[in-house]
């Protein structure tokens, strides 16, 4: 592939995280070329012989693809010509974690960039009022986490309070024997207060909020991937 006299093109990647069992994206962008057949995209993984994925002359070329990625990869074909070389990875596995290289050749030049891909499990927590308990309590549940996260409670009224003495957290292994269900119960809660259940591991941080008043219960939850 002759590119004599051409320059190195800018390739940009973003560290990202994959959720085990779901589809993930390894993000990569580059200085676009105006013609599709001038673009070659290669995805490589450190420690793996063969390619993760190759796209050239407007088509996937999977002749050198490593078997662990067979049938699981795709580029966003319609976005290649505008500089998107991101790779869709189906059914993310724990073993997909590692260092990937996005290598680009165009008629304008060539370039590459690495990205760290973390894999684990993370899910949104849901908080409910547990009326079965002798005193009013809150139950925070999140179905899938890995590695094992930390769980902490906070309250709007009692800011800075340590709730570890009045809460109980358990981790239950899911059927696939990797991810775990997180359950945390907070006891002795008071009405007209907002409580937060925070679940965090080295991949993600999730927060569930609940506001309990005499007349209603309001919930909100959010999930944030770390270092991405």
């Amino acid at each position: 592939f002759g590119i004599s006299g051409k320059h190195f093109i800018t390739v940009t990647t973003f560290t990202s995280a994959g959720n085990i069992g779901e589809d993930g994206t390894l993000s990569c962008t580059f200085e676009p070329d105006i013609k599709l057949n001038g673009i070659v995209i290669q995805w490589l993984k450190e420690g793996i012989k063969g390619l993760v994925h190759e796209f050239k002359e407007g088509k996937d070329d999977l002749s050198q693809q490593h078997e662990m990625f067979r049938g699981r990869t795709a580029v966003f074909a319609d976005q290649v010509v505008v500089g998107n070389a991101s790779l869709r990875l189906k059914n993310v596995q724990l073993t997909d974690a590692g260092t990937y290289t996005c290598y680009i050749r165009t008629s304008k030049g060539k370039g590459n960039a690495n990205l760290e891909y973390k894999t684990g499990a993370f899910s949104m927590p849901e908080i409910n009022v547990d009326y079965n308990a002798s005193s009013e309590s809150l139950r925070c549940e999140a179905p899938r986490w890995f590695p094992q996260p930390t769980v902490a409670w906070a309250s709007q009224v009692d800011q800075g309070a340590n709730f570890s003495e009045v809460s109980n957290t358990s981790f239950e292994l899911n059927s696939e024997n990797v991810t775990m269900k997180v359950v945390s119960v907070l006891y002795n809660v008071t009405i007209n207060n907002t409580y937060s259940c925070m679940i965090e591991n080295d991949i993600a941080k999730a927060t569930g909020d609940i506001k309990v008043t005499d007349s209603e219960v309001k919930r909100r939850s959010q999930l944030q991937l770390l270092n991405s």
Epitope: K35, N37, K108
Partner: antibody, heavy 117, light 107 residues
């Protein structure tokens, strides 16, 4: 929102030159190719050339090499196309168009260049 | 250069009818074809990119298909505002080239 605003209509004599401008706004000017396409009266569309303002890379249709010259000024987010040695066959509407998320997804309003003695 | 041949040159149809426009490339262009609509006195508007991806805001009566050398733009049920000229364009190789256009006119 993305906008491409072109300079006004021009009337030129054969042999003269003309410089048409296209001012971009609403996106990162240096990150996307800007193209020029022309359309003679009652005719189809013809690609002339393109420029990547980030590094001034250009690509020309061989047919227009020596006829068209495109430049980009990043400080004003403006692309220029100069047409030289004008002939009556160069009478056309000249469009600038960019490729942000898809091919030619935004177009200027067009600049009519008339070449007449 | 890659030659894009559109057919028919003119299509005379009534509102509500189905329109099928074809575009043939002189060589394999993978999926690198876009379709544009142009009305008199206006700049072209992108309808379909990468052979089959409907552009934002384009009504779902417009659809594109094909790969390699044969491409089709289909308008499932013509609305009055759909009567215009349609162009296909390849961005597989330079020079980028357009088809000669198909005029969809009211019968």
């Amino acid at each position: 929102q993305v906008q491409l605003v072109q300079s006004g209509a021009e009337v030129k004599k054969p042999g003269a030159s003309v410089k048409v401008s296209c001012k971009a706004s609403g996106y990162t000017f240096t990150s996307y190719w800007m193209h020029w396409v022309r359309q003679a009266p009652g005719q189809g569309l013809e690609w002339i050339a393109a420029i990547y303002p980030g590094n001034s890379d250009t690509d020309y249709n061989q047919k227009f090499k020596g006829k068209a010259k495109i430049t980009a000024v990043t400080s004003t987010s403006t692309v220029y196309m100069e047409l030289s040695s004008l002939r009556s066959e160069d009478t056309a509407v000249y469009y600038c168009t960019t490729t942000v998320a898809h091919y030619f997804d935004y177009w200027g309003q067009g600049t009519m260049v008339t070449v007449s003695s | 250069e890659i030659v894009m041949t559109q057919s028919p040159a003119t299509l005379s149809l009534s509102p509500g009818e189905r329109a099928t426009l074809t575009c043939k490339a002189s060589q394999d262009v993978s999926f690198a074809v876009a379709w544009y609509q142009q009305k008199p006195g206006q700049a072209p508007k992108l309808l379909i990119s990468s052979a089959s991806y409907r552009y934002t805001g384009v009504p779902d009566r417009f659809s594109g298909s094909g790969s390699g050398t044969d491409f089709t733009l289909t308008i499932s049920s013509l609305e009055p505002e759909d009567f215009a000229v349609y162009y296909c364009q390849q961005h597989y190789n330079t020079p980028l080239t357009f088809g000669g256009g198909t005029k969809v006119e009211i019968k």
